[in-house]
């Protein structure tokens, strides 16, 4: 399986919210003895690899994120936690995966990693991540509202508030 | 950089209990496991147990679980074994590791330097 | 539980010569879904703690010295150091983390 990223840089103006998507697709096991987490976490910029430092989202952690099922059953946190901590993340049924942040501050911006772990007879673990830029900005240069830029081409696109 | 220090050798009688430490620094200690080692005099490495410091969820070894207990200290980044019960064969060097697995087993990429614990009457 | 062997116990090997360490599994290790082994490689020196050498059988961690390489697949391991150092004369583990965790009884390498 693999997991693409829609936008590779997600710019927005202080206090607004934003959702960070990822996909998650290609063949999948759905026998009784595998379970998938799809899950998120923040890193950083200048390492040998993408997404090898892990680092919490507003003092959570990847499992306080996670959603888990098998195969591409839809499924959300509705975990007090995270949305005490303006986050929120869910699924559907299309791969689709994400985390909404609410009233984005400065504090926000950095390298942001969405996941997704296989895990046979509750043991053995293959991951696969997608890796993205959130940068929030303040003042006069701020945009009105959040913009994607995909991450295959240098077109922009508007995404509204979640 | 990325460390593990653990605290100092211990002397205990047989049937006490013993609390090693493990202080974190240098990497996000909540996102990743602890887990515990030990090896016997000139014997090999046995795990013991691992524990989540973001959750406090610890997982066992069958042969530890009745006597080992894991613990964390968010605040001071540190995370402690308890092993009750001490008994002549428990003499050993007992290692805190980390490894980088986020639901599954991983290999272990940072060591403590180790704490010896030396059970004896 | 998946048991690991190593053998021999105890190997003589004089400096600049090559060293071949070997490990077994009771089981396979290959985890099908990303066709990876999971095992690794781990160095000892007497009073230090055990320092990853190699992961996924074959991948050197950062830093240390392409005179280590790892091989094999499934059930049986290789660690080969191609030209043996002065610092290299130490004990070696494998360990394996498809289900749980085990590491076998070691290889102590000692200078003939």
């Known amino acids: 399986f693999k997991v693409a990223t829609l936008y590779s840089l997600y710019v927005c103006p202080e206090g607004q919210n934003v959702t960070l998507t990822c996909r998650f697709f290609g063949p999948v096991d759905k026998g009784h003895d595998v379970t998938f987490y799809k899950t998120w976490y923040r890193s950083s910029r200048g390492e040998v690899q993408t997404c090898s430092e892990r680092r919490p989202i507003r003092n959570l952690t990847f499992q306080d994120l996670h959603l888990h099922h098998g195969g591409h059953q839809a499924a959300n946190t509705s975990h007090d936690l995270a949305q005490r901590h303006g986050l929120e993340s869910a699924s559907d049924h299309h791969g689709n995966f994400s985390i909404t942040m609410r009233n984005l501050t400065l504090l926000d911006s950095g390298l942001y990693c969405c996941l997704v772990v296989e895990i046979r007879h509750h043991h053995s673990e293959h991951r696969v991540h997608g890796a993205m830029e959130l940068q929030v900005q303040t003042g006069k240069d701020a945009p009105s509202s959040c913009v994607a830029y995909p991450s295959s081409s240098q077109e922009s696109e508007n995404i509204t508030a979640a | 950089q990325v460390q593990l220090v653990q605290s100092g050798a211990e002397v205990k009688k047989p049937g006490a209990s013993v609390k090693v430490s493990c202080k974190a620094s240098g990497y996000s200690f909540t996102d990743y496991y602890i887990n515990w080692v030990r090896q016997r005099p000139g014997q090999g490495l046995e795990w013991i147990a691992r524990i989540f410091p973001g959750s406090g969820n610890a997982y066992y070894n069958e042969k530890f679980k009745d006597r080992a207990t894991l613990t964390v200290d968010k605040s001071t980044s540190t995370a402690y074994m308890e092993l009750s019960s001490l008994r002549s064969e428990d003499t050993a060097v007992y290692f805190c590791?980390?490894?980088?697995?986020?639901?599954?087993?991983?290999?272990?990429?940072?060591w403590g330097q180790g704490t010896t614990v030396t059970v004896s009457s | 539980n998946i048991m690991m062997t190593q053998s021999p116990a105890t190997l003589s090997v004089s400096p600049g010569e090559r060293a071949t360490l070997s490990c077994k599994s009771s089981q396979s290790v290959l985890y099908s879904s990303n066709q990876k082994n999971y095992l690794a490689w781990y160095q000892q020196k007497p009073g230090q703690a055990p320092r990853l050498l190699i992961y996924w059988a074959s991948t050197r961690e950062s830093g240390v010295p392409d005179r280590f390489s790892g091989s094999g697949s499934g059930t049986e391991f290789t660690l080969t150091i191609s030209s043996l150092q002065s610092e290299d004369f130490a004990v070696y583990y494998c360990?394996?983390?498809?289900?749980?965790?085990?590491f076998g009884g070691g290889t102590k390498v000692e200078i003939k």
């Open positions: 590791a980390r490894d980088d697995s986020f639901y599954g087993y991983w290999y272990f990429d940072v």
């Open positions: 360990h394996q983390y498809l289900s749980s965790y085990t």
